[in-house]
């Protein structure tokens, strides 16, 4: 019953410009070209999808109009693949070009950059923004997609789409207000928050689908629609997750326009069959098709079936299990780990996937043993270890964040995680560690039955940060192993790592921590970021230090830029008393 | 690690049509393609398909005739050929890529004979 079954047409890039229309067709491409060539600039890539759009429109009038009928890739490709300084700018990337589609595209693909060496997004004064908003809103509204896209080069396309569209409402509404400032600052924070962790939990899918594969993350996908539709069937929950999967699919490979064609045609089977699905999505379903899609994407979990049977009688107890097993081993799992997720909600995801796992290992073992039943009839108590670590763990961190604070939380991690991996770049592990200090702020508040499925599906998003940032420049080997081995084990396999004892201490420099009066300009948010940064660079140099070592150094520190920041010759203070700091810390810490 | 087993070779009529498939394991999604090597002769681009399944490019030779496909959830390639004709008949090759484009992982090849 898949959804997206079409016919053949005569021309691939007319079909998709008649069914998106104009405006999210030069987006969409625009996105997807701004997401391959990172560093052209903005007036290129708007002349490129100019043109694009241009020939789209002839093949609208004629699809049988010369190379109306080429594929998108082919045509995407071959116009970045004119871009003048395509070898100066991107180097080895140029020899895509060399190639043929599908190959090219794929090479393309392998050369995204997770971490683009892009100047910072300053924002501007608000009256700046609002008179560039008026004088051309357009051009305002297309230089948002291109400078997210080109940041983010995974973005989930049609959820840009949706993003830019509350740009454009934030300014429509902010600009003829009384306090601009006031009205609009609080919409760009909140999204900008909202489009890093969107980006984020995006590239968790990408990793997932490019690196280990369409089944496990169709595994993802049962697990996470299961305990958001426990009324669907098992059928009607598959079907989602295939058309669901090759959405994915699409966007991942950089295939945007039959990525946000097919995402619109899964949110309307959605609303069209929401009897069969959940009950939560009415509301969803009466709004306009991006903030339809979004809502969708985001719906509360429906409530569960009261009459819920034991999933013993069915996985553990039938004579038939092996039986069932073999006959179709994934259809069997998929439906155990169906079965599974829609009595839990309270679980994480990645638990789910380790308890059908572990459930899978048995019946490969026990199927073929003298006494199946004999062999797998414990299978459950197996569970039990895996249920606890992860709920003791959030136990744990979150009565240290509500004892810490967000701030020292954050530093109890950088510490922790450096000792783990000295290795990686020191501006990683600060904006890693930040980030999953973060997941006390955002699930420790949570009862008891949310706190997990919170706290660790969001930390496997965060920890494919580290993995994707790793996997450009590889450091550790240990990083490595925990990124590659196994997809759900990512969390545990850091959790288990202790200090590692073959790092050879960074040489001490005193430059490193040498600070000056600017510190005293920046936000709450930046001088956090250059403290942590120091943190990192002391427990580089000294991997053995105590916390309370660390603790009375960075007690000082902070108390030298309070002393600092106070004095009238702020930039003799901070050389003076900096020297006295850093000597002081060294016999601190016995450097 | 990485294994491509290609099966569904064997000897057909001119005319005739045969469907060869290939099970990939070890490998995450990747573009994949069918090459081919007659007796004495170089080897032969003949089918590739990218990994959603939305682009696939033919060898002039077979454009029309041969349709390459997938299955992800099954980590399989397929090649239905029809039309066969005498100078079809080589070793046909499951490949895929490094990921870059370039094609780094083979199957050992199945043999397909058009002969009446």
């Known amino acids: 019953r898949g959804v997206f079954r079409r016919d053949a047409h005569k021309s691939e890039v007319a079909h998709r410009f008649k069914d998106l229309g104009e405006e999210n067709f030069k987006a969409l491409v625009l996105i997807a070209f701004a997401q391959y060539l990172q560093q052209c600039p903005f007036e290129d890539h708007v002349k490129l999808v100019n043109e694009v759009t241009e020939f789209a429109k002839t093949c609208v009038a004629d699809e049988s109009a010369e190379n109306c009928d080429k594929s998108l890739h082919t045509l995407f490709g071959d116009k970045l693949c004119t871009v003048a300084t395509l070898r100066e700018t991107y180097g080895e990337m140029a020899d895509c070009c060399a190639k043929q589609e599908p190959e090219r595209n794929e090479c393309f693909l392998q050369h995204k950059d997770d971490n683009p060496n892009l100047p910072r997004l300053v924002r501007p004064e608000v009256d700046v923004m609002c008179t560039a908003f008026h004088d051309n809103e357009e051009t305002f509204l297309k230089k948002y997609l291109y400078e997210i896209a080109r940041r983010h080069p995974y973005f989930y396309a049609p959820e840009l789409l949706f993003f830019a569209k509350r740009y454009k409402a934030a300014f429509t509404e902010c600009c003829q207000a009384a306090d601009k400032a006031a009205c609009l600052l609080p919409k760009l924070d909140e999204l900008r928050d909202e489009g890093k962790a969107s980006s984020a939990k995006q590239r968790l899918k990408c990793a997932s689908l490019q690196k280990f594969g369409e089944r496990a993350f169709k595994a993802w996908a049962v697990a996470r629609l299961s305990q958001r539709f426990p009324k669907a069937e098992f059928a009607e929950v598959s079907k989602l997750v295939t058309d669901l999967t090759k959405v994915h699919t699409e966007c991942c490979h950089g295939d945007l326009l039959e990525c946000a064609d097919d995402r619109a045609d899964l949110a309307k089977y959605i609303c069209e069959n929401q009897d069969s699905i959940s009950s939560k999505l009415k509301e969803c379903c009466e709004k306009p098709l991006l903030e339809k899609s979004h809502c969708i994407a985001e719906v509360e979990n429906d409530e569960m079936p009261a009459d819920l049977p034991s999933l013993a009688a069915d996985f553990v107890e039938s004579k038939d299990v092996c039986k069932n097993y073999a006959e179709a081993k994934d259809v069997f799992l998929g439906m155990f780990l169906y079965e599974y997720a829609r009595r839990h909600p309270d679980y994480s995801v990645v638990l789910l996937l380790r308890l059908a796992k572990t459930y899978e290992t048995t019946l490969e073992k026990c199927c073929a043993a003298a006494d199946p039943h004999e062999c797998y009839a414990k299978v459950f108590d197996e569970f039990k270890p895996l249920v606890e670590e992860p709920q003791n763990l959030i136990k744990q961190n979150c009565e240290l964040f509500e004892q810490l604070g967000e701030y020292k939380f954050q530093n109890a991690l950088l510490v922790r995680y450096t000792k783990k991996v000295p290795q990686v770049s020191t501006p990683t592990l600060v904006e890693v560690s930040r980030n999953l200090g973060k997941v006390g702020s955002k699930c420790c508040k949570h009862p008891e039955a949310k706190r997990m499925p919170c706290a660790e599906d969001y930390l496997s998003v965060v920890l494919n940060q580290l993995c994707v940032l790793h996997e450009k420049t590889p450091v550790s080997d240990r990083v490595t192993k925990c990124c590659t081995e196994s997809l759900v084990n990512r969390r545990p396999c850091f959790s288990a790592l202790e200090v590692d004892e073959t790092y050879v201490p960074k040489e001490f420099n005193a430059e490193t921590f040498t600070f000056h009066a600017d510190i005293c300009t920046l936000s709450e948010k930046e001088r956090q970021i250059k403290k942590q940064t120091a943190l990192v660079e002391l427990v580089k140099h000294k991997p053995k230090a105590t916390k309370e070592q660390l603790k009375a150094v960075m007690d000082d520190f902070a108390a030298f830029v309070e002393k600092c920041c106070k004095a009238d010759d702020k930039e003799t203070c901070f050389a003076e008393e900096g020297k006295k700091l850093v000597a002081a810390s060294q016999a601190a810490l016995g450097l | 690690q990485v294994q491509l087993v290609e099966s569904g070779g064997g000897l057909v009529q001119p005319g005739g049509s045969l469907r060869l498939s290939c099970a990939a394991s070890g490998l995450p999604s990747r573009v994949m393609g069918w090459f081919r090597q007659a007796a004495g002769k170089e080897r032969e681009f003949v089918a590739s398909?990218?990994?959603?399944?939305?682009?696939?490019r033919y060898g002039d030779s077979v454009k029309g005739r041969f349709t390459i496909s997938r299955d992800n959830t099954k980590s399989s390639l397929y090649l239905q050929m029809n039309s066969l004709k005498p100078e079809d008949t080589a070793v046909y090759y499951c490949?895929?890529?490094?990921?870059?484009?370039?094609?780094?992982?083979w199957g050992q090849g199945t043999q397909v004979t058009v002969s009446s």
């Open positions: 490949a895929a890529t490094d990921g870059q484009g370039n094609y780094r992982h």
């Open positions: 398909i990218s990994v959603s399944g939305i682009d696939t």
